[in-house]
């Protein structure tokens, strides 16, 4: 019930967050115009990783594509190279983990293979919003920079006669929307790993085997062959279960699909 | 077609309060800032204020002191222009005017003469 | 703030001439944004609302006939007119729509000579 929470969880926060990487991709607002200086502006300007725009006071907003791809900056290239990739990594993590949810019964589908497709899933949405965390992080860097480039320049002119304002971007909200999805599809990957430590077949469970020597009656019965840890007695509360009424001779052990939690 | 007509009073007393209203048809109102200039007798234009289309933002010249408020009725597509403790130097045309395009003032009412005399 | 200067403040022409009003700013008018420059051109007669002639420095208004234009950039600006008319004898003003508080310029009346 616990595994299905998480990954069910985990599914629903990923979601969340790659719609936000989307949003954040798609949105205009990645800098806005600083309004520092002059709070009043009838003119805002605002930029995307795909397009410009002009607010004006009176209503009136127009916006630009970039209609050149060698023109642009290369960080500019590289942000939207990095949203993208975040976005096909969290597309095909979600369309694997629909797959892989407990709560949905695909055919026969092993227990194992939901697992798998349940980590791989979970390392797709981490890889993600890692992506989008890094492509936010760059261009706000790149902000970070020009900035105090264009306060170092803040007036040119001629003596001081005529003064020509520079421009100044500071953080959109495209970029606090980029933050919160990166980090919100992470910790969504992050559970879906978890969970998927819960759906995995930690041990094969062999049964007590009484071997019985000519002339003694003790009954020798080995641990457990657990996985991960090598040989051991089955020291966690794991149900064995019995093939049934049958002489101990006759006890084989059966590998069940109901001995993992 | 797009039309703006000015109404008030004509004469105001000094430190009286004067209300100036701006009726306009012929287009969509709430989609457009719209501004007061004057003009006082044989002078340049004069910027009074600005209020943006859904009446969210309002800029006023600084020069003008405090005295301006500037509100819009989008039911009614009417802008309205209050001046408090009117003074003589007051005395001006009140034109209203729609913003457009590099908040460029398309279209004006005809203006009104304002006078502010004891 | 920024202030806007019109030169010449009164000028004598007659109808066929060539006509520059020139405009000068405190402040660059051009927003990178966009590279549009905010500055409008109007025109007043007497006893009447002024009536939009030029936007973002150079673009006409729809209606306003081909003889008038504007260009420059940044602090410097002209309107032209290149034949004048007798319908164009009127005060013409420059304005700042780049930023608050806007400005106008003081003016330049045409007359016949």
């Known amino acids: 019930m616990a595994v299905t929470a998480c990954q069910g969880l985990g599914f629903v926060v990923s979601l969340i967050g790659i719609a936000g990487i989307i949003a954040a991709t798609c949105m205009d607002q990645w800098s806005t115009q600083d309004l520092y200086n002059n709070p009043v502006t009838a003119v805002f300007n605002y930029q995307g990783l795909w397009r410009s725009c002009v607010r004006e006071s009176s209503g009136f907003t127009e916006c630009r594509g970039y209609f050149t791809l060698l023109g642009l900056p290369a960080m500019l290239q590289a942000v939207r190279a990095l949203m993208i990739v975040g976005i096909v990594l969290g597309a095909i993590g979600l369309l694997v983990s629909i797959f892989a949810l407990k709560c949905i019964r695909i055919g026969s589908m092993e227990d194992s293979a939901k697992a798998n497709m349940t980590l791989t899933s979970g390392i797709m949405f981490i890889v993600s919003g890692l992506c989008a965390i890094a492509g936010v992080s760059v261009f706000a860097n790149m902000l970070v920079t020009n900035f105090w480039m264009s306060t170092a320049n803040m007036y040119t002119g001629m003596g001081g006669m005529v003064q020509t304002v520079q421009t100044r971007y500071t953080f959109g909200a495209a970029l606090f929307v980029g933050w919160v999805a990166g980090g919100l599809t992470l910790i969504g990957g992050v559970m879906m790993c978890i969970a998927c430590r819960g759906l995995a077949p930690e041990e094969t469970n062999y049964k007590a085997v009484s071997y019985h020597a000519s002339g003694h009656s003790v009954a020798y019965k080995p641990g457990g062959f657990k996985a991960s840890t090598g040989f051991g007695s089955n020291t966690k509360n794991k149900k064995i279960y019995d093939g049934g009424a049958r002489t101990e001779d006759e006890v084989q052990s059966y590998p069940s699909k109901h001995d993992y939690v | 077609q797009v039309t703006l007509r000015e109404s008030g009073p004509a004469l105001v007393k000094p430190t009286q309060t004067l209300t100036l209203t701006c009726t306009a048809s012929?287009?969509?109102?709430?989609?457009?800032?719209m501004s007061w200039v004057r003009q006082p007798p044989g002078k340049a234009l004069e910027w009074v204020a600005t209020?943006?289309?859904?009446?969210?933002?309002?800029y006023y010249n600084p020069s003008l002191k405090d005295r301006f408020t500037i509100s819009r009725d989008i039911s009614a597509n009417q802008l309205v222009l209050k001046v408090t403790n009117m003074d003589p130097a007051d005395t001006a045309t009140y034109f209203c005017a729609r913003q457009s395009r590099g908040n460029a003032m398309d279209y004006w009412g005809q203006g009104t003469t304002v006078t502010v005399s004891s | 703030d920024i202030q806007m200067t019109q030169s010449p403040s009164t000028l004598s022409a007659s109808v066929g001439d060539r006509v520059t009003i020139t405009c000068k700013s405190s402040?660059?008018?051009?927003?990178?944004?966009?590279?549009?420059?905010?500055l409008t051109w109007y025109q007043q007669k007497p006893g009447k609302a002024p009536k939009l002639l030029i936007y973002?420095?150079?673009t006409r208004e729809s209606g306003v006939p081909s003889r008038f234009s504007g260009s420059g950039s940044g602090t410097e600006f002209t309107l032209t007119i290149s034949s004048l008319q007798p319908d164009d004898f009127a005060t013409y003003y420059c304005?700042?729509?780049?930023?608050?508080?806007?400005?106008f310029g003081g003016g330049t009346k045409v007359e016949i000579k």
């Open positions: 012929g287009f969509t109102f709430s989609s457009y800032g």
């Open positions: 209020i943006s289309g859904g009446g969210s933002y309002t």
């Open positions: 304005q700042n729509d780049y930023s608050y508080p806007l400005t």
């Open positions: 973002w420095a150079s």
């Open positions: 402040q660059s008018l051009l927003n990178s944004g966009n590279q549009k420059n905010y």
